[in-house]
């Protein structure tokens, strides 16, 4: 960076090099150039010469003042106009940053996705800090009192093999950056209570032309969990509101769910499951579209495939433009 340049003097910042966004700051430049009594001292921000709020303090030093500085990062350097020198002489440079201290991490959630071999912990980091912010996830066994710490920049995957202290743990998150540190509340977990079954997937749909046409949705999961509760939600793509059906499911075979739908309408379906009685749900599955026929039977297999973690984002980009914000891929 700019801090690695050879300096003929120095540059410093008041109150500090990294500071809270919106503060008033002063940048000082002091020349120490052999055989040069600077005629003028210049400041540059991101390569652009500053023309205002510069004060000459003495023969070798000048100060640049910014009110309400709002840029997350800036490269500053200063130069001197020396007599008998054709070009400005570089004095020194410094990278400065502004941002915010971290918020208290909240909504700490830890889940084990079946077959993943990991416990995944996430949290709401709060407002954007603009500066490098690190998180330390503390995992303390309630049985052995042993505590492990994991450093990360966002979420964390902890191998379940490393959780040797029994089944019960306390988890909390510390957030820290150059402007401050905050700590979340402690979350108590039991490893058996946080398992999320293997993803449920809708594979196909068919409409049977009976007296009252009915649509059958075929869906499945590779889970080995015996007691699983699921929800399937569906709606016409032109609607805002979802209809939800609940199922107690045994995945020893492919599930078939029946719906009585309006003819000649495009519907969208999603499914999610949880271990019965437990806290966390799967994210909603990929969007599955099925258009009911006017009268003739029809079989479709048109799933809008994408990473289920991102179902919230994908929904927002679907061309119908009518899907509601209720479509977040959350696990709560």
């Amino acid at each position: 960076g700019i801090t690695n340049i050879n300096c003929s003097g120095h540059i410093w910042v008041e109150p500090a090099t990294i500071f809270k966004m919106g503060m008033n700051i002063s940048i000082y430049c002091q020349a120490a150039i052999k055989n040069c009594q600077p005629r003028k001292l210049h400041f540059y921000k991101n390569g652009i010469k500053e023309r205002f709020q510069i004060t000459r303090i003495n023969k070798t030093t000048a100060r640049l003042w910014y009110k309400n500085f709002l840029e997350p990062h800036a490269s500053m350097y200063c130069t001197a106009e020396c007599p008998k020198h054709f070009q400005e002489t570089l004095i020194c440079g410094k990278d400065i940053s502004s941002g915010y201290p971290p918020d208290i991490p909240d909504e700490v959630t830890c889940v084990i996705y079946e077959y993943s071999g990991n416990m995944t912990c996430t949290w709401n980091a709060g407002k954007l800090t603009y500066i490098d912010t690190k998180y330390v996830v503390h995992v303390k066994s309630l049985e052995t009192e042993e505590e492990q710490q994991y450093l990360t920049s966002s979420y964390i995957n902890i191998s379940t093999d490393s959780l040797q202290g029994g089944k019960k743990y306390l988890v909390w998150v510390q957030a820290a950056n150059a402007l401050g540190m905050e700590e979340s509340k402690q979350l108590q977990i039991h490893l058996d209570d946080i398992v999320i079954p293997s993803a449920a997937v809708i594979s196909r749909a068919e409409t049977i032309n009976a007296t009252v046409p009915k649509t059958i949705i075929y869906w499945d999961s590779q889970t080995t969990i015996e007691k699983v509760s699921c929800e399937m939600r569906y709606k016409a793509t032109t609607n805002q509101t979802w209809n939800v059906k609940e199922f107690d499911t045994n995945f020893t075979y492919v599930q078939q769910s029946e719906f009585y739908l309006e003819p000649n309408i495009k519907y969208v379906f999603q499914v999610r499951c949880q271990e019965t009685g437990k806290r966390y749900w799967q994210p909603w599955s990929s969007l599955f579209f099925h258009k009911t026929p006017e009268t003739v039977p029809q079989v479709t297999s048109k799933a809008f495939q994408h990473d289920t973690w991102n179902s919230g984002l994908t929904v927002a980009s679907i061309s119908t433009g009518h899907l509601t914000s209720d479509n977040r891929g959350d696990i709560g």
Epitope: H10, E14, P15, F19, S26, Y28, W65, D95, K134
Partner: antibody, heavy 117, light 107 residues
């Protein structure tokens, strides 16, 4: 030559306030930041806060926020540090220091504040 | 707050010895590190700024190095007047913080 001359030692009762002054001479007072740093007996150095006299706005360490007020009077080239709700742990030598380089290159001689009932 | 940790907290050395004091920041502070010398009953004195720049009037036996999180103050040949306590300090973020100090004593 820049000099920072501080006010004399003080003995204060718990719960009271103290105001320490720091008079600058021999340099441009208003343009450089003045900080206050304290040192409890046998302990290390602790930054309390600082001010650039020409701007008048001070920055404080969170630990002292609400209890310390740093001000400056350009007309007399004097900076002040007032600490309120004194307790015995505030017994320390209080230094003013000027930052006319990347480090604190000029220091006052220190003012001993003793908090005792 | 950025924590500054010095080691050792004290050391015994003889005149002429080479002395090294280290300072570690709890997070990267680029080269924003200053070193001070303090003698009993006196105010601190700036020795090194920007991790490695020697303050005017300070003997050349003092030198500083490092950047990021790890820094070193070296006295190449200890003199009788160098027995004192040494502090590192970061001006990178508020609150400006000091190390706990390293006392250099006569062996």
């Amino acid at each position: 030559q820049v000099q920072l001359v501080q006010s004399g030692a003080e003995v204060k009762k718990p719960g009271s306030s103290v105001k320490v002054s720091c008079k600058a001479s021999g340099g441009t007072f208003s343009s450089y930041a003045i900080s206050w740093v304290r040192q409890a007996p046998g302990q290390g150095l602790e930054w309390m806060g600082g001010i650039i006299p020409i701007f008048g706005t001070a920055n404080y360490a969170q630990k002292f926020q609400g209890r310390v007020t740093i001000t400056a009077d350009e007309s007399t080239s004097t900076a002040y540090m007032e600490l309120s709700s004194l307790r015995s742990e505030d017994t320390a030598v209080y230094y003013c220091a000027r930052r006319s380089s990347p480090g604190f290159d000029y220091w006052g001689q220190g003012t001993l504040v003793t908090v005792s009932s | 707050d950025i924590q500054m940790t010095q080691s050792p907290s004290s050391l015994s050395a003889s005149v002429g010895d080479r002395v090294t004091i280290t300072c570690r920041a709890s997070q990267s502070i680029d080269n924003d590190l200053n070193w001070y010398q303090q003698k009993p009953g006196k105010a601190p004195k700036l020795l090194i700024y920007n991790a490695s720049s020697l303050q005017s009037g300070v003997p050349s036996r003092f030198s500083g190095s490092g950047s990021g999180t790890d820094f070193t103050l070296t006295i190449s040949s200890l003199q009788p007047e160098d027995f004192a306590t040494y502090y590192c300090q970061q001006p990178y973020s508020i609150p400006l913080t000091f190390g706990q100090g390293t006392k250099v004593e006569i062996k």
